[in-house]
C-alpha cells in the first residue's frame, strides 16, 4: 500500500489555444485530469487501473502551480494504491479548458481538451522526485513524481506491513526495509522472547520480561543454577533437584542423623578427648583432675581421702598435703608413734597390738573404715556403677547416674536401641549387643531402610518433549523439568508463537 504523488509545476500555453488550434474565450481556464495505470508495452486507451485524480482550475493559459493546496485541490496530487508497487506504470495527464464551473467530463465539450501526454515510467519506491517535461508545438508541461509507502508499509514495493508495537504480540519498531528491530531486552522473530537476566541458566531458568530470571521447579538462586534439595533435607546437598546427599558426619534420609556428635557439638569440657560411639552417642575421656559424663566436674585430689590415721587433707596447686594428728607422720600419716595404750581407734574400733607393741591395728565396726576407724565407709569406692555410670553417695546408701543408653541400679542394663523406632518406612528393628539391625520391607534398603530401591515414579518416563524427570521421595511422585518452549505438569504443551498478529 502506498501513494503515487504527482507534482504539477508549470504549464505553458502562450497562445491560449485548445488542441484543435481554436483559441479559448477569453483564455484557457486550465484544470488537469490524471490517469495512472499498469505499464503497457504500447500506451493505449483503457481503464485507469491504478487510479484517477482531477484538479480544480489551477490557472489561465500559462502558469506555475504552487506546491500546496490550490483552490481546494492538492499539489502534489495523491494517487493511493492498495497493492504491491510494480515499479513500472503508464501515466496520462490531460489539460482541459473549463468554460464554466462544472468540471465533470460529461459537462465538457470534447474539443475542450488543451493537451494530453502519455508516458511509460519506471520508478522505485521512496526515490526523490523525478522531474519530467513534455513539450508539443503549442504547450509545455513540467511536472515531477514519486512513490512513497503508506504508513506501516515498507520495502521496495510497499508490500511489507510492519506496525511498531510493544505488547504481548511483540516489542519492536520497523526498519526502512520493513524488518523488525527488537526493543532492548527482546529477541526472536517477532521480538516476543524476553532476554533473561545475564547468566540465567538456559535450561533451569526462564523469564516473562527482560532481565528477569524465574526458576523452573527444583531450582533456585539468582541465576537458577542452584538445585533445591529434598524437602526436609537438614545437613545435605544436591547436584540435581530433590536429592539429599549428606554432608560428612550426617546420615539418614534427610541427613538429620548426627554421626559425628563430637565435631558438631563439642560436648566434652575441660580439654577432655571425645570419641563418637554411635548416633548422637559419645564418650569423654577426662584429663586428670576432672570427672563427669562431659568431664564438666573438677575433681579435688583430697576427695579420695589419701590421709590416713585421721590426718586432714589440704588441696594444693600441685597436689595435696596431709596434716597428721599427734602420734602420726609420713606422706599419708601412715606411720604411727602410738600404741593401743593411746586408744587410737575411733568410732568403737578395737585395738590390737602388733610387733611387740611397737604398732597396732584397729578393727572397725561396720560403716567405718580407715587405719583408725576414723572414716565413714564411702560406698562408691568400689566403683559399683557399670558402663561408665557416675556413683553418688546418699547418706548410708548410694546411687548410680547412668550414661545415655544405660539403665538399672548399677547402669548394668542396656537401653533398647529399638525403643526410638529408628527403622524408616516400616522396617523391623532388632537389638544387638553392639547396636541394632533393621529388616527392611520390599522397596527399601540401607542401615535404617532409608533408601528407596524399587518404587521410582520416573520409571514410566511420564515427562514429554525430552524433559528431565525427578522423583520426590517423600511423596512417591515425580516432577518434570521442561525444556524451553514447553509447559504443563508433563511438559506436554508447546508454547506456540501466534501464527499471525491481529493488527
Amino acid at each position: 500500500s502506498g501513494v503515487f504523488q504527482l507534482q504539477l509545476q508549470e504549464f505553458i500555453n502562450e497562445r491560449g489555444v485548445l488542441a484543435s488550434g481554436r483559441p479559448c474565450e477569453p483564455g484557457c481556464r486550465t484544470f488537469f485530469r490524471v490517469c495512472l495505470k499498469h505499464f503497457q508495452a504500447v500506451v493505449s486507451p483503457g481503464p485507469c487501473t491504478f487510479g484517477t485524480v482531477s484538479t480544480p482550475v489551477l490557472g489561465t493559459n500559462s502558469f506555475a502551480v504552487r506546491d500546496d493546496s490550490s483552490g481546494g485541490g492538492r499539489n502534489p496530487l495523491q494517487l493511493p494504491f492498495n497493492f504491491t508497487w510494480p515499479g513500472t506504470f503508464s501515466l496520462i495527464i490531460e489539460a482541459w479548458h473549463a468554460p464554466g464551473d462544472d468540471l465533470r467530463p460529461e459537462a465538457l465539450p470534447p474539443d475542450a481538451l488543451i493537451s494530453k501526454i502519455a508516458i511509460q515510467g519506471s520508478l522505485a519506491v521512496g526515490q526523490n522526485w523525478l522531474l519530467d517535461e513534455q513539450t508539443s508545438t503549442l504547450t509545455r508541461l513540467r511536472y515531477s513524481y514519486r512513490v512513497i509507502c503508506s504508513d506501516n508499509y515498507y520495502g521496495d514495493n510497499c508490500s511489507r506491513l510492519c506496525k511498531k508495537r510493544n505488547d504481548h504480540f511483540g516489542h519492536y519498531v520497523c526498519q526502512p526495509d520493513g524488518n523488525l528491530s527488537c526493543l532492548p531486552g527482546w529477541t526472536g522473530e517477532y521480538c516476543q522472547q524476553p532476554i533473561c537476566l545475564s547468566g540465567c541458566h538456559e535450561q533451569n531458568g526462564y523469564c516473562s520480561k527482560p532481565a528477569e530470571c524465574l526458576c523452573r521447579p527444583g531450582w533456585q538462586g539468582r541465576l537458577c543454577n542452584e538445585c533445591i534439595p529434598h524437602n526436609g533435607c537438614r545437613h545435605g546437598t544436591c547436584s540435581t533437584p530433590w536429592q539429599c546427599t549428606c554432608d560428612e558426619g550426617w546420615g539418614g534420609l534427610f541427613c538429620d542423623q548426627d554421626l559425628n556428635y563430637c565435631t558438631h557439638h563439642s560436648p566434652c569440657k575441660n580439654g577432655a578427648t571425645c570419641s563418637n560411639s554411635g548416633q548422637r552417642s559419645y564418650t569423654c575421656t577426662c584429663r586428670p583432675g576432672y570427672t563427669g559424663v562431659d568431664c564438666e566436674l573438677e575433681l579435688s585430689e583430697c576427695d579420695s581421702n589419701p590421709c590416713r590415721n585421721g590426718g586432714s587433707c589440704k588441696d594444693q596447686e600441685d597436689g595435696y598435703h596431709c596434716l597428721c594428728p599427734p602420734g602420726y607422720y609420713g606422706l599419708h600419716c601412715e606411720h604411727s608413734t602410738l600404741s593401743c595404750a593411746d586408744s587410737p581407734c575411733f568410732n568403737g574400733g578395737s585395738c590390737r597390738e602388733r610387733n611387740q607393741g611397737a604398732n597396732y591395728a584397729c578393727e572397725c565396726p561396720p560403716n567405718f573404715t580407715g587405719s583408725n576407724c576414723e572414716k565413714k565407709v564411702d560406698r562408691c569406692t568400689s566403683n559399683p556403677c557399670a558402663n561408665g555410670g557416675q556413683c553418688l553417695n546418699r547418706g548410708p546408701s548410694r546411687m548410680c547416674r547412668c550414661r545415655p543408653g544405660f539403665t538399672g541400679t548399677y547402669c548394668e542394663l542396656h537401653v533398647s536401641d529399638c525403643a526410638r523406632n529408628p527403622c524408616a518406612h516400616g522396617g523391623t528393628c532388632h537389638d544387638l549387643e553392639n547396636g541394632l539391625m533393621c529388616t527392611c520391607p520390599a522397596g527399601f534398603s540401607g542401615r535404617r531402610c532409608e533408601v528407596r530401591t524399587s518404587i521410582d515414579a520416573c520409571a514410566s518416563s511420564p515427562c514429554f518433549n525430552r524433559a528431565t524427570c525427578y522423583t520426590d521421595l517423600s511423596t512417591d511422585t515425580f516432577v518434570c523439568n521442561c525444556p524451553y518452549g514447553f509447559v504443563g505438569s508433563r511438559c506436554e504443551f508447546p508454547v506456540g508463537l501466534p501464527p499471525s498478529f491481529p493488527w
Epitope: 508495452a41 493505449s44 508516458i119 519506471s122
Partner: antibody, heavy 118, light 107 residues
C-alpha cells in the same frame, strides 16, 4: 510532415557489428517511447527493442538481449540500435517506430536492410 | 510470451464483400490490440487501436471488436485499395507480438 528515416544498414559478416540510426522530424521526439521492429525476407514482423521517452526504460526480445543496445539522443531527435555479434538470423529490414495509441501516435520509418552473410 | 494466432492466413474476396479477420491471444491482453494494413515496400498503416478505436483518417468501413483474448477486424464493403496484407499487434506486454498476417486477394 512526420518523418522517421533509418540509416546504417548494409552487408556485414557474422560476429561483426553495425549501428543503425533513426532521425525523427515533424513531431516532438522526446515525448514518445520508440521501437525497433524488423521483418526478415518472406517472414512476418518481429519486435526487437524499446526505449521510453526519457531513456530510463529499455526492453529487448530474448534473441538479441546482450548483443543489441537501444539508445536515444533527444537533443538530436535520433534513435540508435547498436548491433554486436551479428548472426545470419538477424538479416531483415529494420524499421524504427513511434507508437503511442493513447495519443493516436503511430509513425513508422521505411526501414533499412541489414544482411548478415559470410 | 503472448502468442498471437491470426486467421485466415489468406483470403480471396471481391469488391463490396464483407470480410472478417480474427486474432486470438494466448492470454488476456485487455483490449490492447491494433490492426495494421501493409502493402509491399511501404510502412505499416494503423487502422484500429485499443481493439475498436478507428485511427484518424481511416475509412469507417474498417471496424474492430473483441475483448479478453479474441479480436476481430471487419471490412464492411471491400474497396479495390483494400487488397493488402493485414496483421494484428498486441501492445499489452513485452515482447510485442504480431499476428502472422492475412493476405487479402481479389477473387
Amino acid at each position: 510532415e512526420v518523418q522517421l528515416v533509418e540509416s546504417g544498414g548494409g552487408v556485414v559478416q557474422p560476429g561483426r557489428s553495425l549501428r543503425l540510426s533513426c532521425a525523427a522530424s515533424g513531431f516532438t521526439f522526446s515525448n514518445y517511447g520508440m521501437y525497433w521492429i524488423r521483418q526478415a525476407p518472406g517472414k512476418g514482423l518481429e519486435w526487437v527493442a524499446f526505449i521510453s521517452h526519457g531513456g530510463g526504460i529499455t526492453y529487448y526480445r530474448d534473441s538479441v538481449k546482450g548483443r543489441f543496445t537501444i539508445s536515444r539522443d533527444n537533443s538530436k531527435s535520433t534513435l540508435y540500435l547498436q548491433m554486436n555479434s551479428l548472426r545470419a538470423e538477424d538479416t531483415a529490414v529494420y524499421h524504427c517506430a513511434a507508437l503511442n495509441w493513447e495519443l493516436g501516435i503511430d509513425y513508422w520509418g521505411q526501414g533499412t536492410m541489414v544482411t548478415v552473410s559470410s | 510470451d503472448i502468442q498471437m494466432t491470426q486467421s485466415p492466413s489468406s483470403l480471396s474476396a471481391s469488391v463490396g464483400d464483407r470480410v472478417t479477420i480474427t486474432c486470438r491471444a494466448s492470454e488476456d491482453i485487455y483490449s490492447n490490440l491494433a490492426w495494421y494494413q501493409k502493402k509491399p515496400g511501404k510502412s505499416p498503416k494503423l487502422l484500429i487501436y485499443a481493439a475498436n478505436r478507428l485511427q484518424d483518417g481511416v475509412p469507417s468501413r474498417f471496424s474492430g471488436s473483441g475483448s479478453g483474448t479474441d479480436y476481430t477486424l471487419t471490412i464492411s464493403s471491400l474497396q479495390p485499395e483494400d487488397f493488402a496484407t493485414y496483421f494484428c499487434l498486441q501492445g499489452s506486454k513485452f515482447p510485442l507480438t504480431f499476428g502472422q498476417g492475412t493476405k487479402l486477394e481479389i477473387k
